[in-house]
Interface confidence: low
């Protein structure tokens, strides 16, 4: 999501941000959920060979080999079973890294909403970050950029999108007359509201930050149960629980 109308953040002040790369190029964003798990948008991985994918943590300037950076391959991808590429419905996936991140000042976790949390209501102040272009003309950012946005009423957003939204989408607006938000190169990055990942960058309009087509996110709170179910089922356990079986290939 190219961040429009934003600002460069203090380096490593968003330690949960992940850069998903293919062919050595930044492709999408994501956030670190657990030391071995990254949440991103499902559409980022359509027709992509996971073997060529890398996840970079602890980055600020992507073009620099910063000492804080940790680079991982992608062990497994779990896309939401109801993801629909045409409508962007249920646009969420989980990446299991091929190693565990070492948590520290530059690499940290971001929590999703609680299982019973309600999504942010219209007017809530949030922020969205990414390494995408900073203009409509493929201008690269100096480092990780962030924009402050506000949650938009779903009726208003749905009207702007001609009725095409689904119930598990979340929208934002700039909050003032300036163009502010994301576009297309950092899908999967988190919308952070009240220090929780309430949204995942999903899609937007032709022009960055255009209020006529507000930014649309996957509403994370609708998928919290699914997220933790995937993590629980796929993570190695200390020992089998009574009445359960370990997933194939998982060592005790």
């Amino acid at each position: 999501a190219q961040i429009i109308g934003g600002h460069e953040v203090t380096p490593h002040s968003r330690p949960y941000m992940a850069s998903v790369r293919f062919g050595g190029q930044h492709h999408c964003g994501g956030f670190l959920l657990r030391a071995r798990w990254v949440v991103s948008a499902a559409h980022c991985f359509s027709h992509r060979d996971l073997r060529t994918g890398l996840v970079v943590l602890g980055a600020h300037v992507l073009s620099t080999a910063e000492p804080t950076q940790q680079v991982f391959g992608i062990d497994a991808l779990t896309t939401h079973p109801d993801y629909h590429p045409m409508t962007h419905a249920n646009d969420i996936c989980l990446l299991r890294l091929n190693g565990s991140a070492v948590l520290g000042p530059a690499v940290g976790l971001l929590r999703p909403p609680g299982r019973r949390a309600r999504p942010p209501t219209a007017g809530t102040r949030c922020r969205v970050a990414g390494w995408g272009f900073v203009s409509d003309f493929e201008e690269l950012p100096p480092g990780l950029m962030e924009a402050k946005v506000r949650v938009l009423d779903p009726d208003v957003c749905n009207s702007s999108w001609k009725g095409h939204l689904t119930l598990t989408m979340l929208c934002t607006r700039s909050g003032d007359s300036h163009r502010r938000g994301f576009c297309s190169a950092d899908s999967g990055g988190p919308l952070v509201c009240r220090n929780r990942a309430h949204g995942l960058v999903s899609f937007s309009g032709l022009w960055c930050g255009d209020p006529k087509t507000p930014d649309v996110y996957t509403q994370v709170s609708a998928f919290v149960a699914w997220i933790w179910d995937v993590v629980r089922r796929s993570s190695p356990q200390p020992g089998p629980l009574p009445g359960t079986t370990r997933p194939p290939g998982e060592a005790a």
């Epitope: 609680g114 299982r115 019973r116 949390a117 309600r118 999504p119 942010p120 209501t121 219209a122 949650v151 009423d153 779903p154 009726d155 208003v156 749905n158 009207s159 702007s160 009725g163 119930l167 598990t168 979340l170 509403q219 709170s221 609708a222």
Partner: antibody, heavy 122, light 107 residues
Framework: EVQLVESGGGLVQPGGSLRLSCAAS????????ISWVRQAPGKGLEWVGA????????YYADSVKGRFTISADTSKNTAYLQMNSLRAEDTAVYYC???????????????WGQGTLVTVSS | DIQMTQSPSSLSASVGDRVTITCRAS??????VAWYQQKPGKAPKLLIY???FLYSGVPSRFSGSGSGTDFTLTISSLQPEDFATYYC?????????FGQGTKVEIK
């Protein structure tokens, strides 16, 4: 098929209490907030309040604040409207309705129950 | 609270007539307006949401328009089953508020 079924209405004296139930089926109860809307005889619609069943958050109209309490039992897919200190002007048909948008606190109501009549009279 | 004022409060029309009901909000509500139809003894039914979007299963003779403070519900060719009371509702801010209703009667 989405269904909302209210029950618990009846005749009650001024100052009395009544609890209405709204049994929901055909959708994921915790994904949508539930509103209560009332309609006095021959009058228009008035929103009473709403609950988000997934965390129990509630919101009330000023006219009922402090007297009415909305709750939900997610294990039973049921929302409740507890009405205390009832007045004659609370006489109405009470409807529960599903709020269509997952993240709208209250908003467009796409499915409604059949309503239950509450009469407050001595 | 935002006030929603409907006009007219009632109207008489014949089958086949074009009927227009208006709703005015006391402040800007963008396009966050819904329209409902209610028949005697029945619950309201959603017709239009987001000012102009036809709800699933609603006949195409119903249409909505407007943004800001002024909104319109139009029935292009009134059918016998359309005689009912119609309500507008803003969902822009809490609490949601309804118009007082417009009763469409047979002429």
């Amino acid at each position: 098929e989405v269904q909302l079924v209210e029950s618990g209405g009846g005749l009650v004296q001024p100052g009395g209490s009544l609890r209405l139930s709204c049994a929901a089926s055909g959708f994921t109860f915790t994904n949508n907030s539930i509103s209560w809307v009332r309609q006095a005889p021959g009058k228009g619609l008035e929103w009473v309040g709403a609950i988000s069943p997934n965390n129990g958050s509630t919101y009330y109209a000023d006219s009922v604040k402090g007297r009415f309490t909305i709750s939900a039992d997610t294990s039973k897919n049921t929302a409740y409207l507890q009405m205390n200190s009832l007045r004659a002007e609370d006489t109405a048909v009470y409807y529960c309705a599903r709020n269509a948008w997952h993240y709208s606190w209250v908003g467009v109501m796409d499915y409604w129950g059949q309503g239950t009549l509450v009469t407050v009279s001595s | 609270d935002i006030q929603m004022t409907q006009s007219p409060s009632s109207l008489s029309a014949s089958v086949g007539d074009r009927v227009t009901i208006t709703c005015r909000a006391s402040q800007d509500v963008s396009t966050a307006v819904a329209w409902y139809q209610q028949k005697p003894g029945k619950a309201p039914k959603l017709l239009i949401y987001s000012a102009s979007f036809l709800y699933s299963g609603v006949p195409s003779r119903f249409s909505g328009s407007g943004s800001g403070t002024d909104f319109t519900l139009t029935i292009s060719s009134l059918q016998p089953e359309d005689f009912a009371t119609y309500y507008c509702q803003q969902s822009y801010t809490t609490p949601p508020t309804f118009g007082q209703g417009t009763k469409v009667e047979i002429k």
